[in-house]
């Protein structure tokens, strides 16, 4: 029970990575991250 980051994202699909607190769905090509997701395996806000 440490503070170290989990080695993998336990999310459905292959498009999630640890961004900040949670595993988030990344942004599509050509878009940039405005804000990370606010729940496990959530969607990032992209622009």
């Amino acid at each position: 029970q440490g503070g170290t980051r989990s080695p993998r994202c336990d999310c459905a699909g292959d498009f999630h990575k640890k961004i900040g607190l949670f595993c988030c769905r990344g942004c599509p090509a050509g878009h940039y991250l405005k804000a990370p997701c606010t729940e496990p395996c959530g969607n990032s806000t992209c622009l």
């Epitope: 029970q1 503070g3 989990s6 607190l21």
Partner: antibody, heavy 123, light 111 residues
Amino acid sequence: EVQLVESGGGLVKPGGSLKLSCAASGFTFSSYAMSWVRQSPDKRLEWVAEISSGDTYTYYPDTVTGRFTISRDNAKKTLYLEMSGLRSEDTAMYYCARDREAYYGQQYVMDYWGQGTSVTVSS
Amino acid sequence: DIVLTQSPASLAVSLGLSVTISCRASESIEYSGTSFLQWYQQKPGQPPRLLIYGSSTVESGVPARFSGSGSGTDFSLNIHPVEEDDSAMYFCQQSRRLPWTFGGGTKLEIK
């Protein structure tokens, strides 16, 4: 032994600013996300800010967004909360808390809390 | 935001008996088989202390008299048998989704 010691509270006028500090010891500070939680005089608890372990991402509820800024200095093992545009409803005891990851690093539990620093906003 | 409603707001229980405090969420706080629900104890002049996380996992160092249960939207904290030292405020808290939110608290008095 994990220790969190807050400081910087006090009496401030509405519209004023204050910067709180939280000195951490007894654990690898840089490996943990950290939060600020406040407790109003009526004893209600409200989470007001969080910062990821890597110092990259910050999170706030709507009630303080744009007025409060959380930051950390991992070298100094210190957490900060900069508060501006203070209102009477910001009057509270402010606690810093360590966030321990659980369940694939996607659940966070506030497992250690400091003793708190009191903030009073009044004219 | 996820709203947590605790009941009762206060109660008095005789020493040695059992007590149950309830916490209801405005929406499910379950994810992937885990309930993202914590219970904290707070005594006067002290910060909150983590008792239980994940609805039912007792934190290290917490007496076995404390137990948690529930899933979805309905959760409870049970203390059995109640001791004098258990006189305190108890809060539930969700970490399913930001912003983290807390219940309004339950004040437990020992008779």
